[in-house]
Interface confidence: low
């Protein structure tokens, strides 16, 4: 009986304190794992950089909604 596979947990311990221009963002991932110290959002920029952000910040929420709309429009 093999051991269960261990999946690494991604957590955000610090969040960015400035706004990232929306045109630089490519996608986002929500961090809601109860083992993480805080709920957060990881934005991936078009240059491939990943940045933690606070989902309580309005610019973060607006950016998420903007990306949602882009992906919605890409659906056939």
């Amino acid at each position: 009986q093999p051991d269960s596979v261990s999946i690494p947990i991604t957590c955000c311990f610090n969040v960015i304190n400035r706004k990232i221009p929306i045109q630089r963002l490519e996608s986002y991932t929500r961090i809601t794992n109860i083992q993480c110290p805080k709920e957060a959002v990881i934005f991936k920029t078009k240059r491939g950089k990943e940045v933690c952000a606070d989902p309580k910040e309005r610019w973060v929420r607006d950016s998420m909604k903007h990306l949602d709309q882009i992906f919605q429009n890409l659906k056939p």
Partner: antibody
């Protein structure tokens, strides 16, 4: 539990004025904003600005308020609104309100703001 | 940018009747909508948030509904105490927004 505004006054056009909002018994928690909303006599509500009550202190303004109005969190229980170059059109009752985040996951179902606590308002009159 | 249009500007209804107030956003606000009641000389009071959730202590005769750009608050079995001005407010975005509130609807109870 209350919010109370102060600083309203009769001022001349072109003057500056600072309003203060003091919270007592109200949670200035991580998941809330402190905001200013105004209401001209006999008119509707007009949002001015909000400041994140959490550590970031991020500020948000109505497009018409940028530049002339400045919202600041001056302590854990106090928020101010600085107003410059006042005109007769700025005559109004200025309300302080707490904008709470109804914080649920996943998006976009949650993080709905609503102003759940309001002060009684302070009257600003701009007249020569 | 996310302008809120409320209709009608005024409505008169007898006690026991039904009042419907509509709020239309210029763009989809994804249920990021609240309703407030304001009586003369008082600050507004939160009635409904998240388009349809009643705030604490609000009577069940108030009902919020809608999605996308169109939202409604309905007062069934209106009472004299419901005479007030009602405002909708979007919280979908604060970017390039002139006002988050609708223009208001005065409800007169006959």
């Amino acid at each position: 539990q209350s919010l109370e505004e102060s600083g309203g006054d009769l001022v001349k056009p072109g003057a500056s004025l600072t309003l203060t909002c003091k919270a007592s018994g109200i949670d200035f928690s991580l998941y809330s904003y402190m905001c200013w909303v105004r209401q001209a006599p006999g008119k509707g509500l007009e949002w001015i600005a909000c400041v994140d009550a959490g550590a970031s202190g991020s500020t948000y303004y109505a497009s018409w308020a940028k530049g002339r109005f400045t919202i600041s969190k001056t302590s854990s229980t106090t928020v101010t609104l600085q107003m410059t170059s006042l005109t007769a059109a700025d005559t109004a009752t200025y309300f302080c309100a707490r904008g709470i985040l109804y914080y649920t996951w996943p998006y976009p179902a949650g993080a709905i703001d609503a102003f759940d606590s309001w002060g009684p308002g302070t009257l600003v009159t701009v007249s020569s | 940018a996310y302008d809120m249009t409320q209709t009608p500007a005024s409505v008169s209804e007898p006690v026991g009747g039904t009042v419907t107030i509509k709020c239309q956003a210029s763009e989809s606000i994804s249920n990021y909508l609240s309703w407030y009641q304001q009586k003369p000389g008082q600050p507004p009071k939160l009635l409904i948030y998240k388009a349809s959730t009643l705030a604490s202590g609000v009577p069940s005769r108030f009902k919020g509904s809608g999605s996308g750009t169109e939202y409604t608050v309905t007062i069934s079995g209106v009472q004299s105490d419901d005479a007030a001005t009602y405002y909708c407010q979007q919280s979908y975005s604060s970017s390039n927004v002139f006002n988050t509130f609708g223009g208001g609807t005065e409800v007169v109870v006959k």
